[in-house]
Every structure is written in C-alpha cells, then in structure tokens.
C-alpha cells in the first residue's frame, strides 16, 4: 500500500484547489482571526502504527469533506472548485479506506487511535462553532479556509515522516 505517496499528491491538489477558492481579500478579515487549537500533538507522535496514522489522517479528511459539503459552504464557494475539491477529498478517503484494510492484515495493532480521532473531531467542532457564531460570514469562511490550508500543510509533514518510516 503506497498511500503516503499517492495521498501526498492528492493533498497537494487539494491545497491548490483550496488556494483558488478565495473569494474576498483576506486583508479585510484580519480581525476575524481565531485560535482553533489545531491538535498538533496528534500529528507529532512516532508511536503510531501505519494503520493508526492513516485512520487519524482519514478523520481529518472526512471532517474537512463534511465541513465543505454543507449548504452554507455551497452558498460561499465557487461551485465548480468546490465540486473538484470534494471529489479530491472523496478519492483520498477511498484510497485510505482500502489502505487501512490492507494494513490491518499486516499489523497486530488496533485499527484506530481513539484519543487522536476524538481530538480531530473536537478541532472541527471548534471550527463549526466559530462559523456559527460568526453567522457563516465571508470573512469567517476565509479564516476557516486559511486554517484548513494550514492543517493540510501540517498533516503533509506528518505524511512525509510516515513515508520515511516505511
């Protein structure tokens, strides 16, 4: 299973699409910055087995997919870019699911790291709460887009470490 290689390419494509999705000048949104508390420690550990690491990445992609699949998201972003982005994420999720099934046969470890997955879930809950509090304003979405780009970039470093471990 060569997930880290294929996922890294998919991650890069997703980042490019996210970068293209901007609709307003971010300079008008500085005062809307917010600390979402990205769970960095969940992407720092070397304690993960490959299947566990993939399940954490899977959760992050799944939550991102859910966030950008809402009707509020559809009302904000340019439809064709949003569709391409969702398709890219969906492809990554399918690749990961196939990879985890393959890896579980190799590893004698639990499939999921429950605490790490919960930390990722809570991170996205904070993002959703922020959007709700800001009434899904264009600037709130800009801040979230920037945050997701950052979290994708940070998870890319995690993936590269995972690939080096192989």
């Amino acid at each position: 299973c060569d997930l880290p290689q294929t996922h890294s390419l998919g991650n890069r494509r997703a980042l490019i699409l996210l970068a293209q999705m901007g609709r307003i000048s971010p300079f008008s949104c500085l005062k809307d910055r917010h600390d979402f508390g990205f769970p960095q420690e969940e992407f720092d550990g070397n304690q993960f087995q490959k299947a566990q690491a993939i399940s954490v990445l899977h959760e992050m992609i799944q939550q991102t997919f859910n966030l950008f699949s809402t009707k509020d998201s559809s009302a904000t972003w340019e439809q064709s870019l949003l569709e391409k982005f969702s398709t890219e994420l969906n492809q990554q999720l399918n690749d990961m699911e196939a990879c985890v099934i393959q890896e579980v046969g190799v590893e004698e470890t639990p499939l999921m790291n429950v605490d790490s997955i919960l930390a990722v879930k809570k991170y996205f809950q904070r993002i959703t709460l922020y959007l709700t509090e800001k009434k899904y304003s264009p600037c709130a979405w800009e801040v979230v887009r920037a945050e997701i780009m950052r979290s994708f970039s940070l998870s890319k470093i995690f993936q590269e470490r995972l690939r080096r471990k192989e």
């Epitope: 970068a19 500085l30 005062k31 910055r33 600390d35 945050e147 780009m149 950052r150």
Partner: antibody, heavy 121, light 107 residues
Amino acid sequence: EVQLVQSGAEVKKPGESLKISCKGSGYSFTSYWIGWVRQMPGKGLEWMGIIDPSDSDTAYSPSFQGQVTISADKSISTAYLQWSSLKASDTAMYYCARHPGLNWAPDFDYWGQGTLVTVSS
Amino acid sequence: DIQMTQSPSSLSASVGDRVTITCRASQSIDRALNWYQQKPGKAPKLLIYFASSLQSGVPSRFSGSGSGTDFTLTISSLQPEDFATYYCQQSFDFPLTFGQGTKVEIK
C-alpha cells in the same frame, strides 16, 4: 531554517527609481504574507504595506499608498519594494518580515536583515 | 487608524530589576498585540504575540499581559543583553501600527 535575505544597501539620487528585494527560504513562501517596515535614522518602526505572494494581493498603509509599490514573484520566492521617484526623505532602513496571514500564529516572526537606502544629491 | 501609545519613552534600570512597559491602543484590539525587541543595527525580534504568548526561543523572564486597550510587557529580572528598544504593534486590523518605542538603558 527559515530565512529572509534582503538585497544590499543602495545609494541613489533624488528622482531615481529603485527596487529592493526580499528572498524567502526554508518555508512555503506562498503560505505567509510578506510585510515591509520602514525605520528612518534614529526613529521608530513604521508599517508600509503587505503582500500575499500566493496571488499578489496587497494592502498599504495610507501614509505609503501611492508612494511605493509592493510586488512578489512566487516562482523565485521573492518580494519587492519599489519607488518610481525617490526623495531625500526616503532615506531609511527597510525591513521585510513574514506574517502568517489569517492563521493564528506569531506575526512577523522572521525578519530580513534590512536594506539601507540612502537618497542624496 | 489605530494609534498605539507606549510609556515610558525611555527608562533607566539596573541588572536584576523588574521592568514594566505599557502600551495603550486608541480602540479595543482584543488580544491582537505583539512585542518586539530591537538592538542598534539589528532587525527587530519578536518576543510576545497575541498579548501573552511567548515566542519560541525567548527567555521566560519576558511576559506579556492585557486585552482590549491596555497591555504590559514585563521583564522579571533585567539581564545585560536586555538593554534595547522595545516596540508594541497591533495586529487587529490594517493598517498595522507600532508604538513609538521604549528605550531601556543602563542606570
């Protein structure tokens, strides 16, 4: 290692044009904005403007709007500050610094070494 | 524009002293305030961001506090290398603005 390396000192005459540079390395250049800060001799820091290298969107301080132009070439990870017609009052040290944009991260955490611009007839 | 006013503009202190510099914004800036240290002939160095977060690699004797309009930078025990000029800067909205600076000199 994150670095911002600025071009060397310049001595110019009033009315001349000038373009100074700031090259980023050791990080994703398009993931951060680049700001420019002026420091006149013996004075404090003044924010001039900022650029998002990913799309070259800019914002200027009203004090510097129309006086300078900020640009970037993401293919070579370089930001620029330029004047079309220098004045003696442009004599100063100019710094570039990176900014995390809309992310909750330290502002202006890395700075260039500065470019001294001297304008004298 | 948001005006930033630092006080004092200069102060004399001895090694080991506790030093406090204040910064006031002309309107509420939440916690969007940074503190920088600058030594002669050098670029500024970030010390504190978002009012109270210590930048990586900065000694723990430096601390920041405040929110809204009033902010403080404290050096708990002044060291010889701390003699420099300190600037506050608001990052709440454009145009970004700096305080006029506080020069910390040896008594």
